[in-house]
């Protein structure tokens, strides 16, 4: 009685259960009455990452330097190449098919989270008591200078973009 379902890592063809090809190999010939499934290793720059019956291996992803990409992990016969972005850039999608420059946080905003190869800079407004006077992809909000600890007094109040200005105490008192 011909089978209607096959075991794991097998497939049904011509009323026979044939072994799937292992990762890293492609199908040449289905199994027959006389032979096991015939599989061949994927070529250079090709891969198959599952037990399969594919007659062609997939091409490794190309990390195009013109798009700001570089190889993070070289592909094998069983895995695809993983791309990431050059320093200062990050991926535009999870598949990392192209890169964009990390955004900078404007004055009045500081870096909450520095960008990675896959995520952009996260900025946050500088709260009261903190400031940022530069546009930067790395600088956090800095605390205002404490005039008191320097035996000075505030001459000009700080903002989210400027530090306080300290000055000497009034000696006429």
């Amino acid at each position: 009685e011909p089978p209607t379902a096959c075991r794991e890592k097998q497939y049904l063809i011509n009323s026979q259960c044939c072994s799937l090809c292992q990762p890293g190999q492609k199908l040449v010939s289905d199994c027959t009455e006389f032979t096991e499934t015939e599989c061949l290793p994927c070529g250079e720059s090709e891969f198959l990452d599952t037990w399969n019956r594919e007659t062609h291996c997939h091409q490794h992803k190309y990390c195009d330097p013109n798009l700001g990409l570089r190889v993070q992990q070289k592909g094998t016969s069983e895995t695809d190449t993983i791309c990431t972005c050059e320093e200062g850039w990050h991926c535009t999608s999870e598949a990392c098919e192209s890169c964009v420059l990390h955004r900078s946080c404007s004055p009045g905003f500081g870096v909450k989270q520095i960008a990675t190869g896959v995520s952009d800079t996260i900025c946050e407004p500088c709260p009261v008591g903190f400031f940022s006077n530069v546009s930067s992809a790395f600088e956090k909000c800095h605390p205002w200078t404490s005039c008191e600890t320097k035996d000075l007094v505030v001459q000009q109040a700080g903002t989210n973009k400027t530090d306080v200005v300290c000055g000497p105490q009034d000696r006429l008192r």
């Epitope: 040449v28 010939s29 009455e33 032979t35 096991e36 015939e38 061949l40």
Partner: antibody
């Protein structure tokens, strides 16, 4: 439909090289394997060797040193070459596909001076 | 090289009677995948061999159900439940588990 047809020289002199071609139709040699069997007159079947779909070959232990099997997928042909022939190589030579029951009609090769 | 030994060499049978042919292998024919690639052919006089049974016990399409195959490991049997005139010829066992593939020496079935 699936067909295999052998074409041989018929008569070959001792010590010469035998060349037989198996021309197939109805399937691709890149996806199917083909093997060769011979049968001397009044005797049994002898497996000679095979050409796998992927291009690799296997040979009978006793014939390995003088047998070469190759294929031209674009021409749908598998070739058998056997050197240093003797009278003992007189036989009907068959090519066979490695699934189902697809045999060529066979070609008789006589080795004689 | 693996040897397949068939017995008997010659088998005279009366029409309508059963027949049995043995095939012994010099090593196990069970493959690593669990398949056993032992097959049976019939070669009628003046014809190419014809596949009867593949992988021990599977009847090839169009083969009458009076033919059956059994066995495992190294011992295999072809049985014909009731011999008919068209069953005359030479029966060969064959294995494709191990390279090089091999054929048995043949069993000639004739009518008494």
């Amino acid at each position: 439909q699936v067909q295999l047809q052998e074409s041989g020289p018929g008569l070959v002199k001792p010590s010469e090289t035998l060349s037989i071609t198996c021309t197939v139709s109805g399937f691709s040699l890149s996806r199917y394997s083909v093997y060769w069997v011979r049968q001397p007159p009044g005797k049994g079947l002898e497996w000679m060797g095979m050409m796998w779909g992927g291009g690799s070959t296997d040979y009978s232990t006793s014939l390995k040193s003088r047998l070469t099997i190759s294929k031209d997928t674009s021409k749908s042909q598998v070739s058998l070459k056997m050197s240093s022939l003797t009278a003992a190589d007189t036989a009907v030579y068959y090519c066979v596909r490695t699934d189902g029951d697809y045999w060529g009609q066979g070609t008789l090769v006589t080795v004689s001076s | 090289e693996l040897q397949l030994t068939q017995s008997p060499l010659s088998l005279p049978v009366t029409l309508g009677q059963p027949a049995s042919i043995s095939c012994r292998s010099s090593q196990s024919l069970a493959s690593s995948s669990g398949n056993t690639y032992l097959h049976w052919y019939l070669q009628r006089p003046g014809q190419s061999p014809r596949l009867l049974i593949y992988k021990v016990s599977n009847r090839f399409s169009g083969v009458p159900d009076r033919f059956s195959g059994s066995g495992s490991g190294t011992d295999f049997t072809l049985k014909i439940s009731r011999v008919e005139a068209e069953d005359v010829g030479v029966y060969y066992c064959s294995q494709s588990t191990h390279v090089p593939w091999t054929f048995g020496g043949g069993t000639k079935l004739e009518i008494k």
